[in-house]
Interface confidence: medium
C-alpha cells in the first residue's frame, strides 16, 4: 500500500514520517545546532537503527545532536535522553564533547568547536 | 511551509515527490531490475543533481538502471532515454554493459551478471 | 564577570537606518560555543527576538525584521552591531544586547543583559 | 512562529500570597521555556530554566514546572520585592519569542 510521508519542511528528505535534511555548509557544532533550531528541527538524534535504516548509507560525517556530559560522564542528545546502549559504535577520532555521525552506526568523537557538516532532523 | 511527500510504497524514502528504496540483498542486474518491477519501481534512474541531491551522500555501489546499449554506444536508462551529459562521471571499473550508481553522481561500470545491493525508485 | 553596554544614537528619523553597536567586556566575543542576541522591548509588541551571531559572522534573524536587518561583529574590537533599516515609528523601542545561558550544549534564555537603550524615531 | 499566551496579564495581590501565573504555547517545547522578572527600567532578569531549573541566586519561593504546552510560574509567598512583571520566552525554535507579560502589582 502507498502512503505521504511527513509533513516536512520544503526538500526535506521524510522517512517512517521523520523529516530528515543533509546540510553542506560546515559549522561548529553550536552553529548546526542553531541552523536545525531556525528550521524548526534539532540535530539528528539516533533513536532507532530499525526506524532509521536510510543513516547506514549516509557517506562521511556529520554532526548530530549527541554531547559529553562531563559532569556525570553520560553522552546525550539535545533534549536530554541518554545515548542508548549499542545503538552507536562512539569511536575516540579527537578529544571532544561533540559527536560526528558516520555510516553504519557510527559516532565519532570530536572537538565541538571543529567545523563539519551536519544532519537535520525534526520528528512528525 | 511543510508539506507531505509521496505518495510512496510503505516504508520508502521520499524526497521532492520521489520514492527510494536501498536493497540490502545482492542481485545481478536483471534479478535488481525484476525485484523493483515486482514493486511497482524501476531501478534509480538519474535526472536531475538538484532534484536527486540526495544521491550524492550515499555511499557503496548499487545498480541503477543505466544500460550500455553495444550497437550504438550510447548508455541509457530502461524506459529508453538517454543518459544527459553531464550527469553522471561514468569509470569503468569493470568491462560490461551494466552500471553502478556511487556516491556524488559516479556510475561504475559492471557486468550485468555480478551481485550488488541496488536502488529502486518510484516517481510519483 | 561579562557584561555588555548598547551605544548608538537615541533619535533615528523615519526611512534612516538605526545603528547600534554593543562592546562586550570581561570576556571574549570569539569564544565558538557563544552567540550574541539583539532583543528590543515596545510598548506595543513586548520583547522581541531580532536576531543573533557568532563570532564566526554566521547569522539567525527573525523572519519579521530579516529583509531589514544585519548583525555584524568584529572580533578585533569585542563588539557586535545591528543595523536596521528603513525604520518607522514602530521600530520605536528600548534596545538590548545579550547572552544566552549555554549549559550542557543548550541555550536556556538569556542571562546576560545591556542596559538597554532607548531609540526613538521621529522626524 | 510559535506563540506564548500569558495568564492572567494582570495580577493585584498581597505579600505574603501565593502567586501562579500560567503561560501557553501555540505547539509543544519540551522544557525549553524561560521565566524573567522585570522591574521598571531595567533589563529583564533570567529566573527560570529550562522550565524547572532555578537559576543561582534566584529566592527558592519561585519555583517553575509544565512541559509541552502548560507551564507555570509559581512564587510561594510574595515579597515586597517581587512586584514586577514576568515574560515567559520559548527556546524550542527560532524565532525565540516572548509572552506579552504579566504584570504583578500591590493589592
Known amino acids: 500500500t502507498e502512503s505521504y510521508c511527513g509533513p516536512c519542511p520544503k526538500n526535506w528528505i521524510c522517512y517512517k514520517n521523520n523529516c530528515y535534511q543533509f546540510f553542506d555548509e560546515s559549522k561548529n557544532w553550536y552553529e548546526s545546532q542553531a541552523s536545525c533550531m531556525s528550521q524548526n528541527a534539532s540535530l539528528l538524534k539516533v533513536y532507532s537503527k530499525e526506524d532509521q535504516d536510510l543513516l547506514k548509507l549516509v557517506k562521511s560525517y556529520h554532526w548530530m545532536g549527541l554531547v559529553h556530559i562531563p559532569t556525570n560522564g553520560s553522552w546525550q542528545w539535545e533534549d536530554g535522553s541518554i545515548l542508548s546502549p549499542n545503538l552507536l559504535t562512539i569511536i575516540e577520532m579527537q578529544k571532544g564533547d561533540c559527536a560526528l555521525y558516520a555510516s553504519s552506526f557510527k559516532g565519532y568523537i570530536e572537538n565541538c568547536s571543529t567545523p563539519n557538516t551536519y544532519i537535520c532532523m525534526q520528528r512528525t | 511551509t511543510e508539506s507531505y511527500c509521496g505518495p510512496c510504497p510503505k516504508n520508502w524514502i521520499c524526497y521532492k515527490n520521489n520514492c527510494y528504496q536501498f536493497f540490502d540483498e545482492s542481485k545481478n542486474w536483471y534479478e535488481s531490475q525484476a525485484s523493483c518491477m515486482s514493486q511497482n519501481a524501476s531501478l534509480l534512474k538519474v535526472y536531475s543533481k538538484e532534484d536527486q541531491d540526495l544521491l550524492k551522500l550515499v555511499k557503496s555501489y548499487h545498480w541503477m538502471g543505466l544500460v550500455h546499449i553495444p550497437t550504438n554506444g550510447s548508455w541509457q536508462w530502461e524506459d529508453g532515454s538517454i543518459l544527459s551529459p553531464n550527469l553522471l562521471t561514468i569509470i569503468e571499473m569493470q568491462k560490461g554493459d551494466c552500471a553502478l550508481y556511487a556516491s556524488s553522481f559516479k556510475g561504475y561500470i559492471e557486468n550485468c551478471s555480478t551481485p550488488n545491493t541496488y536502488i529502486c525508485m518510484q516517481r510519483t | 564577570q561579562l557584561q555588555l553596554q548598547e551605544s548608538g544614537p537615541g533619535l533615528v528619523k523615519p526611512s534612516e537606518t538605526l545603528s547600534l553597536t554593543c562592546t562586550v567586556s570581561?570576556?571574549?566575543?570569539?569564544?565558538?560555543?557563544?552567540?550574541w542576541v539583539w532583543i528590543r522591548q515596545s510598548p506595543g509588541k513586548g520583547l522581541e527576538w531580532i536576531g543573533n551571531?557568532?563570532?564566526?559572522?554566521?547569522?539567525h534573524y527573525n523572519p519579521s525584521l530579516k529583509s531589514r536587518v544585519i548583525i555584524s561583529v568584529d572580533t578585533s574590537k569585542n563588539q557586535f552591531s545591528l543595523k536596521l533599516k528603513s525604520v518607522t515609528a514602530a521600530d520605536t523601542a528600548v534596545y538590548y544586547c545579550?547572552?544566552?545561558?549555554?549549559?550542557?550544549?543548550?541555550?536556556?534564555?538569556?542571562?546576560?543583559w545591556g542596559q538597554g537603550t532607548t531609540v526613538t524615531v521621529s522626524s | 512562529d510559535i506563540q506564548l499566551t500569558p495568564s492572567p496579564s494582570f495580577l493585584s495581590a498581597s505579600v505574603g500570597d501565593r502567586v501562579t501565573i500560567t503561560c501557553r504555547a501555540s505547539?509543544?517545547?519540551?522544557?525549553?521555556l524561560a521565566w524573567y522578572q522585570q522591574k521598571p527600567g531595567k533589563a529583564p532578569k533570567l529566573l527560570i530554566s529550562?522550565?524547572?531549573t532555578l537559576q543561582s541566586g534566584v529566592p527558592s519561593r519561585f519555583s517553575g514546572s509544565g512541559s509541552g504546552t502548560e507551564f507555570t510560574l509559581t512564587i510561594s509567598s510574595l515579597q515586597p520585592e517581587d512586584f514586577a512583571t514576568y515574560f515567559c520566552?520559548?527556546?524550542?525554535?527560532?524565532?525565540?519569542?516572548f509572552g506579552q507579560g504579566t504584570k504583578v502589582e500591590i493589592k
Open positions: 545579550a547572552k544566552p545561558l549555554l549549559r550542557d550544549y543548550y541555550y536556556y534564555g538569556v542571562d546576560v
Open positions: 505547539q509543544a517545547i519540551s522544557s525549553y
Open positions: 520566552q520559548q527556546l524550542n525554535s527560532f524565532p525565540w519569542t
Open positions: 551571531i557568532y563570532s564566526s559572522g554566521s547569522t
Open positions: 570581561g570576556g571574549s566575543i570569539s569564544s565558538s560555543s557563544y552567540y
Open positions: 529550562p522550565a524547572s
